[in-house]
């Protein structure tokens, strides 16, 4: 398939279409003029390299629009002035603005709880599966194994912290070198990125606001895969932060620290323990090709034991195992002998829900997978739908003034690393890179933070999650300190190297250009946010799984046409945006191809198909859930739920009417706005109140 | 309560083959080992060896090697010892006896089988 | 194999006596060392195992002592249902091994 969708009958004049394709302007222009220009304005753009920021797709199947999608809305203010209360009406103000901040926090509470809970399911379902992926012993050989492995792990275990530490105490136990470890490191830096394109999946039902939200997430995906890309050859050729690292801790005498602060978990432990507690040893012994381990539930029944040395009998191959000859007995069939032996003894059973079901992983898992799903998606809705209330206006214009605005010239370009040094200190509060950047998601979505700003926030969370965990390795126990410090400095040198690649020169922030072209195929296409989804962080890696276990000549044999014909794409690509008369006619554009290998137009057909038995449904489950939230927040009868329809939807894209898909967080000033009939508000039907 | 139940008395030829049997009760029967031993005016006790119902695993005296054959059926908790190629040495009181779990002291035996070769 | 020797193959005591059986390992067996009762026509019972414990429902009249190659089997206070057969055995190692035996007899 060629890269970008719907090449054939492109527009002939980029220029009318391609942002910077003849002038120099800001990446991030504001009709409104509410925010500055970002950091490292006015760069000289050429038509390649910002033509992957718009899917073609759009260019023919959609008019040619004069604001740029990637624009932030402006939030229009439709509530009263503050000036033009009574008394009453300024003390209710207050408490409404109380009541909003508190039912913010709850709804952000439960929100971070969810994701938690959410990591805990997916190791569940996926998490003896994932450490048996770790047991293979073909990591040792082969770096691309590990980067999958690392991949598959962390998509599975939804926390790339747990499948870090299989990896220490892996090589705390010489089962496998810091050589082999440092790929599946890489590896679970990629798949933690899953989790806030989950989150960004939420916000599907807003064309504009599921572009912004899907590119601000994926921008996170596209940073580590291109990092991975670069890096990993560089590491095997190299071997620079084995190296590297490996000479910081030689150079240090460590002492063991104290345990790395738990900041957010100390308030979202309480809730989260009393739903699921898990024993995240289980993992870990799987790994370890420990076969008792396999048969453990990961679920945790006793939370206070005791532990107790006693002197017990135990069987033993032969006498010479026996601790001293006076010692040793016989059964008749066997050998015993007395052993010190340790044993746990239960105290307490843990205080969750599953504790006395007894149901398996599975059931737990997949249990826990829904529920904690719909109350990640229904706190999002919440947050989302609160901020779209409070942010308007002034609060609006002051909120993202200060995320968005530079500093002034000539330390404009500080900004950035600003925003790097925030989105570190915020994970490292947090403990949870995936925690900061989900949290990030909902505010690209509603607009309040550009893509160009979030790229620096999550690449500061990628620093974050390593400082974290060179916390975590400096209070770790004398045997894995070594080896967990070298794995974390590591995750920490990758992730710095990844920045200096892709942040400092403008020219080469590739990842925000590629989200944003992805932001725009998946808002046309909605199915392909899905398909990324699954092809990026399952299929990939489960293929490179499959061929790396048959060997390195069927490794090669298939990777090689594959590698050779993608280059080929790109090459060709770039020819074709470049100096197309340079290629024969036929190469000048993608028809020599089958449709449906430069379009997604058949493939949307022939999805359209297969789920438009599901469409009524849905629309109408839609339809009463929007109508609840509207009585519950006291909306009058014009929130448009009936837009929930695609039929309903494609009757307003024939009348020319920019589309808002299915969304039950409507702010009816936005809608109205964007359909350019902003008035002024009346009493009866403002439903910007939450 | 615990009780190991033997037949009385075998009468059998010499060089044929006698296979007597040890019904349980009382306990489970897989959990303990079980114990043969013979017993002549002559010779005083001798361990001819012992099998774990649990697994059929048994263990055998170098002495009685390939003349007593030891099996269990766990269905009917019944223990059994094969006798082959009897000679008059092999007349004697057999017992069977329950081992005590992790050790070789036996807790409970049954009444004897006399096992009389004549011919 | 071990051997388990009962120097006395007879002892002869009245009731109330105290009777010491003495058994002899010819290597050392640790404490792995059972003592049993053989009434005539009866088949042998454990009074004690690990050399020095009762076995359920033994009178406390009965005491095993020793470790390593010797050991001693008392009777406290011989009573007339106690005329019997005693023997040791050993589970140090295979094959397991019992001593000839000691007969008590009244006075």
């Known amino acids: 398939m060629a890269p970008w969708p719907e090449l054939g009958d492109a527009q002939p004049n980029p220029s009318k279409y391609l942002e910077g394709a003849t002038s120099q302007q800001p990446i991030t222009p504001d009709k409104s003029k509410e925010t500055n220009k970002t950091d490292n304005t006015e760069v000289p753009v050429t038509k390649f390299e910002l033509l992957p920021t718009y899917s073609t797709a759009t260019l023919i199947e959609e008019p040619t629009e004069v604001d740029d999608p990637w624009n932030l809305p402006t939030l229009q203010d439709s509530g009263i002035k503050w000036s033009e209360r009574d008394a009453k009406g300024k003390i209710l103000c207050v408490f409404q603005g109380i009541g909003r901040l508190i039912l913010l926090l709850g709804f952000l509470y439960f929100f971070v709880c969810s994701l938690d809970v959410l990591s805990s399911a997916f190791q569940l379902v996926g998490g003896k599966m994932a450490g048996q992926f770790f047991s293979n012993s073909s990591i040792m050989s082969n770096p691309l194994l590990g980067l999958v492995i690392g991949v598959l792990v962390t998509v599975f275990v939804q926390s790339s912290s747990t499948s870090t530490s299989i990896v220490v105490s892996m090589v705390a136990s010489s089962l496998l070198t810091v050589r082999a470890a440092i790929p599946i490191i890489m590896g679970a830096n990629i798949g933690t990125s899953i989790t806030n394109t989950i989150v960004a999946l939420m916000q599907v039902g807003d064309r504009s606001e599921f572009r912004r939200a899907f590119a601000g997430a994926t921008v996170h995906d596209f940073f580590n895969w291109l990092s991975v890309l670069v890096l990993l050859p560089v590491e095997v050729a190299t071997h620079y932060l084995e190296v590297v690292t490996q000479l910081i801790v030689e150079s240090f005498h460590f002492k063991n620290g104290e345990d790395a602060p738990d900041l957010l978990k100390v308030i979202t432990k309480p809730f989260t323990k009393l739903i699921v507690q898990l024993d995240k040893k289980v993992i870990s012994q799987i790994a370890m090709n420990d076969e008792t381990a396999k048969n453990k539930s990961l679920v945790k029944i006793w939370c206070k034991t005791f532990t107790n040395m006693t002197q017990m009998n135990v069987t033993v191959p032969s006498m010479a195992n026996c601790t001293s000859p006076s010692l040793c007995w016989t059964d008749g069939i066997q050998i015993w002998t007395m052993k010190n032996v340790t044993y746990k003894e239960n105290i307490a059973k843990c205080q969750h829900i599953f504790v006395n079901f007894h149901l398996p992983d599975l059931a737990v898992g997949i249990i826990l997978l829904i529920i904690s799903l719909l109350v990640l998606c229904g706190c999002l809705i919440m947050i989302v739908k609160i901020l779209g209330s409070v942010l308007k206006g002034q609060v609006a214009t002051v909120i993202k003034k200060t995320i968005n605005t530079d500093f002034p010239f000539p330390f404009a370009w500080l900004t950035g690393y600003l925003a790097i040094l925030v989105g570190a200190g915020m994970t490292f509060i947090v403990q949870s890179s995936s925690v900061f950047t989900s949290a990030l998601t909902p505010l690209i979505g509603i607009g309040v933070i550009t893509i160009e700003r979030a790229y620096p926030l999550t690449l500061g969370s990628n620093i974050g999650t390593t400082t974290t965990a060179i916390l975590a390795a400096l209070a770790s126990p004398g045997n894995t300190l070594r080896s967990s410090l070298q794995i974390a400095l590591c995750h920490f040198f990758f992730n710095i190297s990844g920045i200096l690649l892709w942040y400092p020169i403008p020219f080469t922030r590739l990842p925000i250009r590629m989200a944003k072209g992805l932001g725009n195929i998946s808002a046309k296409y909605r199915w392909f946010a899905i398909f990324y989804l699954i092809i990026f962080f399952f299929l990939i890696p489960l293929t490179v799984f499959g061929l790396s276990l048959a060997g390195w000549p069927v490794l090669v044999g298939v990777g090689v046409p594959v590698v050779f014909i993608i280059i080929l794409v790109l090459c060709l690509r770039l020819l074709q945006s470049r100096c197309p008369r340079v290629l024969p006619k036929k190469l000048q554009n993608w028809n020599f191809l089958p449709l449906c290998m430069h379009s997604l137009k058949p493939w949307d057909a022939v999805i359209s198909k297969f789920t438009g038995p599901f469409q009524m449904p849905c629309c109408c489950c839609c339809r009463v859930c929007c109508r609840v939230c509207c009585l519950l927040c006291g909306c009058p009868k014009c929130c448009r739920c009936s837009k929930c329809c695609q039929d309903l939807e494609e009757g307003q894209e024939a009348q020319g009417v920019p589309v808002k898909a299915p969304e039950t967080f409507d702010n009816i000033t936005i809608s109205r706005e964007a359909q350019g009939e902003v008035r002024a508000p009346d009493s009866k039907t403002e439903c910007t109140a939450l | 309560q615990v009780q190991l139940q033997q037949p009385g008395a075998e009468l059998v030829k010499p060089g044929a083959s006698v296979k007597m049997s040890c019904k349980t009760s009382?306990?489970?029967?897989?959990?303990?080992?079980m114990h043969w031993v013979k017993q002549t005016p002559g010779q005083g006790l001798e361990w001819i060896g012992a099998?774990?119902?649990?697994?059929?695993?048994?263990a055998y005296n170098q002495k009685f090697k390939g003349k007593a054959t030891l099996t269990a059926d766990k269905s009917s908790s019944t223990a059994y010892m094969q006798l082959s190629s009897l000679t008059s040495e092999a007349s004697a009181v057999y017992y069977c006896?329950?081992?005590?779990?992790?050790?070789?002291?036996?807790?409970?035996w049954g009444q004897g089988t006399s096992v009389i070769v004549s011919s | 194999d071990i051997v388990m020797t009962q120097s006395h193959k007879f002892m002869s005591r009245s009731v109330g006596d105290r009777v010491r059986i003495t058994c002899k390992a010819s290597?050392?067996?640790?404490?792995?060392v059972a003592w049993y009762q053989q009434k005539p026509g009866q088949s042998p019972k454990l009074l004690i195992y690990?050399?020095?414990t009762r076995h359920s429902g033994v009178p406390d009249r009965f005491t095993g002592s020793g470790s390593g190659t010797d050991f001693i089997f008392t009777i406290s206070n011989v009573q007339s249902e106690d005329l019997a057969d005693y023997f040791c055995?050993?589970?140090?190692?295979?094959?397991?091994?019992f001593g000839a035996g000691t007969k008590l007899e009244l006075k």
């Open positions: 006896a329950r081992g005590m779990y992790g050790h070789g002291a036996m807790d409970y």
């Open positions: 009382g306990y489970t029967f897989t959990t303990n080992n």
């Open positions: 099998i774990y119902p649990g697994s059929g695993a048994t």
């Open positions: 290597q050392d067996v640790g404490t792995a």
């Open positions: 690990w050399a020095t």
């Open positions: 055995q050993q589970y140090s190692s295979n094959p397991l091994t």
